[in-house]
């Protein structure tokens, strides 16, 4: 067979949540190979992912270190086998990323409830504080130690009997909401961050309702 | 001009440490992974693992992970390589090598290590 | 970790005659690399990407192969090749060598 060219990667794509962080590309490698570099825009190029026949790069380890700073990522293509490389005077061809602020743009993942707990007509909901990758003194940190204030809950709640549904928020991890006495609620969660302008909101948890295993029930 | 330049010959006793140094000048030092291949005598040449200077982060041959260290001082633009409980077997030269792609390369002279009682 | 099996690990061969060397991988590999070394001194790199060589390497040197057998050919061998030859994965971590085949003259 004869020589084919090198090809540049292109669609590059950031695909993050809860900062679980990778960065996608195309085309499958044909006589190929891909090694990824990823910078802070004042820092050096780190290769990862060296002289991978993959179309994915997990970038999570670089991203945690700073979740606020702004990311680039170049994909390089190297020629591997009967190939000739496109690049100038040897270099090879290469592709930028989109820029990746972690912080304003990593999506929320689909939060949990973690338990609920009636108390007469109160009824406290809880939702898991999800860990992140993200560490600090060696400790991985929560969503919550992560986004603090800056991440509510909507709770949205309704009797098991109808389909009116009710919402509140919190910008803790738990709720405490009336209920009617000897009526059994069904419950839902989501996160959000209302400052944000993309990737504001999660998907909805599961529906939780009471009169199952997570709930607790005190007169 | 990029240059590796590595610390002089090493005579240790079975059991011993050995830390060899590589100074790198001629590029920017914090950029680059680093490389640590070695040599038996008459022999092939082995993968020892690699440190990025930026951040310290390693990726050592899981042979040598509980003998080798790989660290680096920034300030002065030098790689180190650390074995301990050394060995006869361990008797070999030593190269640091600045990973790059393609035509580029860049290796330091070598360090000769000898385990010997 | 892929282990890179070269053969012959000795050759003596008469100027302008071809040679071949062979390196197997346990598994398969996509990138190989192939380095020249002579006595005394550090190993260069001589073949990067498979086929691809290094810049002032001599175009009677070639590489090729794919999968799990690779090949290193000098197809009229001059007194300056004398020398060993070490293929090498960057597939997968750790990076592997080959055990090194010496090509002398005769």
């Known amino acids: 067979s004869g020589t084919t060219n090198t090809v540049a990667a292109y669609n590059l794509t950031w695909k993050s949540t809860n900062f679980k962080t990778i960065l996608e590309w195309e085309p499958k490698p044909v006589n190929q190979v891909y090694t990824v570099q990823i910078s802070t825009k004042s820092g050096d190029w780190k290769s990862k992912c060296f002289y991978t026949t993959d179309t994915e790069c997990d970038l999570t380890d670089e991203i945690v270190k700073d979740v606020k700073q702004t990311y680039l990522a170049r994909v390089f293509s190297y020629p591997a086998g009967n190939v000739e490389s496109t690049g100038s005077a040897g270099e090879p061809l290469y592709e930028n990323s989109p820029e990746f602020t972690p912080y304003l743009e990593t999506n929320l993942g689909q939060p949990t409830i973690q338990s609920f707990e009636q108390v007469g007509t109160k009824v406290n909901v809880t939702v898991e504080d999800e860990r992140t990758l993200v560490r600090r003194n060696n400790t991985f940190l929560s969503l919550r130690d992560v986004f603090g204030k800056d991440l509510i809950y909507t709770l949205y709640y309704w009797k098991s009997s109808s389909s009116g549904k009710k919402t509140a928020k919190t910008n803790t991890n738990e709720f405490l909401i009336d209920v009617d006495k000897g009526e059994n609620y069904c419950f839902s969660v989501q996160a959000v961050i209302p400052s944000r302008t993309v990737n504001r909101k999660s998907t909805d948890s599961p529906v939780e309702c009471m009169g199952q295993e997570k709930g607790e029930f005190r007169e | 001009q990029v240059q590796l330049v590595q610390s002089g010959s090493e005579l240790k006793k079975p059991g011993a440490s050995v830390k060899v140094s590589c100074k790198a000048s001629?590029?920017?030092?914090?950029?680059?992974?680093m490389n640590w291949v070695r040599q038996a005598p008459g022999q092939g040449l082995e993968w020892i693992g690699m440190?990025?200077?930026?951040?310290?982060?390693?990726r050592l041959n899981q042979k040598f992970k509980d003998r080798a260290v790989l660290s680096v001082d920034k300030s002065v633009s030098t790689a180190y390589l650390q074995i301990c409980s050394l060995k006869a077997e361990d008797t070999a030269v030593y190269y640091c090598a600045r990973e790059d792609y393609g035509s580029s390369d860049y290796w330091g002279q070598g360090t000769t290590v000898t385990v010997s009682s | 970790e892929i282990v890179l099996t070269q053969s012959p690990d000795f050759q003596s061969v008469t100027p302008k005659e071809k040679v071949t060397i062979t390196c197997s991988a346990s598994s398969s590999v996509s990138y190989m690399n192939w380095y020249q070394q002579k006595p005394d001194q550090s190993p260069k790199i001589w073949i990067y990407g498979i086929s691809n060589l290094a810049s002032g390497v001599p175009s009677r040197f070639s590489g090729s192969g794919s999968g799990t057998d690779f090949t290193l050919t000098i197809n009229s061998l001059e007194a300056e090749d004398a020398a060993t030859y070490y293929c090498?994965?960057?597939?997968?971590?750790?990076?592997?060598f080959g055990g090194g085949t010496k090509v002398e003259i005769k």
């Open positions: 090498q994965q960057k597939s997968s971590f750790p990076w592997t």
């Open positions: 001629g590029y920017s030092f914090i950029s680059y992974w």
């Open positions: 440190i990025y200077p930026a951040d310290s982060e390693t």
